[in-house]
Interface confidence: low
């Protein structure tokens, strides 16, 4: 059987190293050897690359080596396959060396910011030594932030051959580490070099961005002073790695700047003790390069009437988010402040807040909140410097069954009735909204009965019991996830009512 006709001939010119062609099939059923016929010097010369020795036999690749590698040039390549039964020739293929040249990768030797030019890194590299001097090289620069797996790319060409090359990569994030790698190819070639070794550079730091500023107004103290907890954070969109050295706060009663007080802190929260009047508070952050724009907050007077414009609010869960939506009667209000914190019996340990603009909804990823915890969510309307009345709701991102059932007791035991009372489960043990309570009760050796009541009921009178009978009873508290029973209690109905007995005695 004749060998298969060599197909899919592919050639590549490794600059100043070799000219290599490959083809298929890579393996023949019987022993096959190959000749690769080449014409070069624009057709004036020809030669053969042979794979017929035992080490290269049946191997679908052959390389032409210097000094007969001419460049620039056009080659023709034809592959002959031969076995014991005869010869099969490929079609003649044509190769322009400029189009199939592959060179070494460049070498980055400097990645640095340029003083005074923001959000830019200057990359310097050395052109590969083995690259044709006259040719324009095209480059791909890949870059990513150090913590990202996602590469971005920029393409450009360079004609300058006399010195280390330079490229200015702009529109980066401030004060951020970037990883760089570079590859190149002659402009006409279809083959890129490998990627250079990765190098890291950091963009210049900038003066801080603005701050978002908020407050929690606490009840006035006995001496009339009002504690106000100030909080601030980087404005939305500020670079993650921007570094603040500290914060300056100054505040004064409205219309009385003579009474300005100043505070310097490195924290992102500070408690002020204010009088009953309206106050203005200002905060800036600073670093070695300057200050942020001023964040301003008006603290209303103690007796100031606040406007109300949120009419309703709903919290709903999607697959991976908690979404809070609200309806407002004031179309001119387009900024809202959302507060959320765990509803715990003690002082909340984590208090969060976020500004919302041009929307009447707020979303948070479920994994940012703890499952089985109840969160208080409040939305404040903000109209210029005025903060309106908040509207509040509660939400769980995931409910579970309560960790404990209700503590129950039996009161007012009668002949055929009993009043059962139970305590609310502590917040920390509810694990969801208590939607109802179910009272399970059973006479000794008798059938079990149950009665379900709403979650706002903590007492229930059971009737139609049997006189002088022992009962066991427990109350189950249920969330959407299921119920948990409280401790079992036992009681015995009376044989004769106290009231009746008392009456008899009088006669």
């Amino acid at each position: 059987v004749l060998p298969a006709k060599p197909e899919n001939i592919s050639c590549i010119f490794y600059y100043e190293e070799n000219f290599t062609c490959t083809w298929s099939p890579e393996k023949e059923a019987s022993y096959t050897w190959y000749k690769v016929k080449r014409t070069y010097s624009y057709g004036y010369k020809s030669d053969i690359c042979s794979t017929d020795n035992s080490t290269r036999g049946n191997h679908a690749s052959c390389s032409f080596l210097p000094p007969t590698i001419t460049n620039p040039d056009n080659y023709t390549i034809q592959v002959e396959a031969q076995n014991a039964d005869g010869i099969m020739k490929s079609d003649i293929t044509y190769w322009n060396l400029d189009a199939i040249m592959k060179i070494e990768p460049p070498e980055i030797f400097s990645v640095k910011s340029v003083l005074g030019i923001k959000r830019m890194l200057q990359i310097k590299w050395i052109r590969p030594v083995l690259a044709p001097h006259s040719s324009t090289l095209k480059y791909t620069l890949r870059f990513r932030t150090i913590n990202s797996a996602y590469w971005m790319e920029v393409n450009f060409t360079k004609e300058d051959i006399d010195r280390d090359e330079t490229y200015n990569l702009t529109e980066l994030q401030a004060f951020t580490e970037y990883v760089m790698t570079l590859r190149c190819a002659p402009a006409e070639s279809m083959f890129w070099s490998g990627w250079s070794q990765e190098k890291v550079g950091t963009t210049e730091e900038e003066a801080p961005y603005g701050l978002d500023l908020w407050r929690v107004l606490k009840p006035a103290m006995v001496d009339g002073r009002r504690p106000v907890q100030l909080m601030w954070k980087k404005a939305t969109g500020a670079p993650v790695l921007e570094k603040a050295l500290g914060y300056n706060i100054w505040y004064f009663p409205e219309n009385n700047t003579n009474l300005t007080e100043t505070v310097n802190t490195t924290n992102q929260t500070h408690e002020l003790y204010l009088g009953g009047k309206t106050y203005w508070v200002y905060v800036v952050s600073y670093n070695s390069l300057g200050e942020s724009p001023v964040a301003t907050l008006r603290i209303p007077a103690l007796n100031e009437k606040t406007f109300q414009c949120i009419e309703a609010m709903q919290a709903c869960l999607t697959q991976d988010q908690l979404v809070v939506e609200w309806q407002s009667s004031a179309p001119e209000v387009d900024t809202w402040m959302v507060e959320w914190f765990p509803d715990v019996d003690s002082e909340p340990s984590s208090f969060s807040w976020e500004s919302v603009s041009q929307a009447r909804n707020w979303t948070i990823q479920k994994d940012e909140l703890k499952p089985l915890w109840c969160y208080n969510i409040s939305v404040y309307p903000v109209l210029r410097d005025r903060v309106g009345q908040p509207y509040s709701t509660q939400a769980y991102v995931q409910e579970g069954i309560p960790s404990a059932g209700p503590v129950t007791q039996a009161d007012s035991i009668g002949v055929k009735t009993v009043t059962i009372t139970w305590k609310e489960i502590p917040k920390s043990k509810r694990n969801g909204f208590i939607k109802n309570y179910t009272i399970f009760y059973q006479a000794e050796d008798g059938k079990e009965f149950s009665k379900t009541v709403n979650s706002n009921i903590l007492q229930y009178r059971l009737e139609s019991l049997t006189r002088r009978t022992s009962y066991s009873l427990q109350v189950m508290a249920s969330t959407n996830a299921g119920g948990t029973n409280g401790t079992k209690i036992n009681f015995k109905t009376l044989s004769i009512s106290h009231h009746h007995h008392h009456h008899h005695h009088h006669h």
């Epitope: 640095k112 003083l115 190098k199 550079g201």
Partner: antibody
């Protein structure tokens, strides 16, 4: 402490070669370039070349190309400079220096090695 | 190769005065210029990088300026300890080159 400690002074015959070592402590040479600079007696500073120890890539000043060979052994955190075909004009103190590509300056210099060429 | 030409080659200044050393590049090197000081018998020490940035621990009496082809190192309120040879160096383009050095002497 970040430092570069070089090998001791050498006396070599004309035409011979010399190999100077530069051992780093307090940092990994793979994360920097190591440059070599020479200073002839009473004269200025002359750049010889540099190596990227992470991959062995080198770059030489044209006047040292072919005579200087820069190598590095990352397992011992040491860089080497070999200069061949020595002549009287090569009598000098040879320095290695760290060049960190992020900041792009020579911030740490070696202790210096005096090479004397004498028959 | 880029040639870095320093002037003057030697300078004698009284304590408390200001010393200025100039460095001219034969072609633009943007701001890729570094200044070193070398004291007798010691290795060079980094003073200024990227033309105008003071290296950590260098007193603010030392300042660098310039871009393109003309650069200056200024030492204000010179002290006795400032004696030594001062070199400029460009790392804009290979081969990297140094100025001839300026010897500063304190009177």
């Amino acid at each position: 402490e970040v430092q570069l400690v070089q090998s001791g002074a050498e006396v070599v015959k004309p035409g011979a070669s010399v190999k100077v070592s530069c051992t780093a402590s307090g940092f990994n040479i793979k994360n920097t370039f190591i440059h070599w600079v020479r200073q002839r007696p009473g004269a200025g500073l002359d750049w010889i070349g540099r190596i990227d120890p992470a991959n062995g890539n080198t770059k030489y000043a044209p006047k040292f190309q072919g005579r200087a060979t820069l190598t590095a052994d990352t397992s011992t955190n040491t860089a080497y400079m070999q200069l061949s075909s020595l002549r009287a004009g090569d009598i000098a103190v040879y320095y290695c220096a760290r060049y960190y590509y992020v900041s792009s300056y020579f911030d740490v210099w070696g202790t210096g090695t005096l090479v004397t060429v004498s028959s | 190769d880029i040639v870095m030409t320093q002037t003057p080659l030697s300078l004698s200044v009284s304590p408390g005065e200001t010393a200025s050393i100039s460095c001219k590049a034969s072609q633009s090197v943007t701001n890729d210029v570094t200044w070193f000081r070398q004291k007798p018998g010691q290795s060079p020490q980094l003073l200024i990088y990227s033309a105008s940035n003071r290296y950590t621990g260098v007193p603010d009496r030392f300042s660098g300026s310039g871009s393109g082809t003309d650069f200056t190192l200024r030492i204000s309120t010179v002290e006795a300890d400032d004696t030594g040879v001062y070199y400029c160096q460009q790392d804009y383009s290979s081969p990297w080159t140094f100025g001839q050095g300026t010897k500063l002497e304190i009177k």
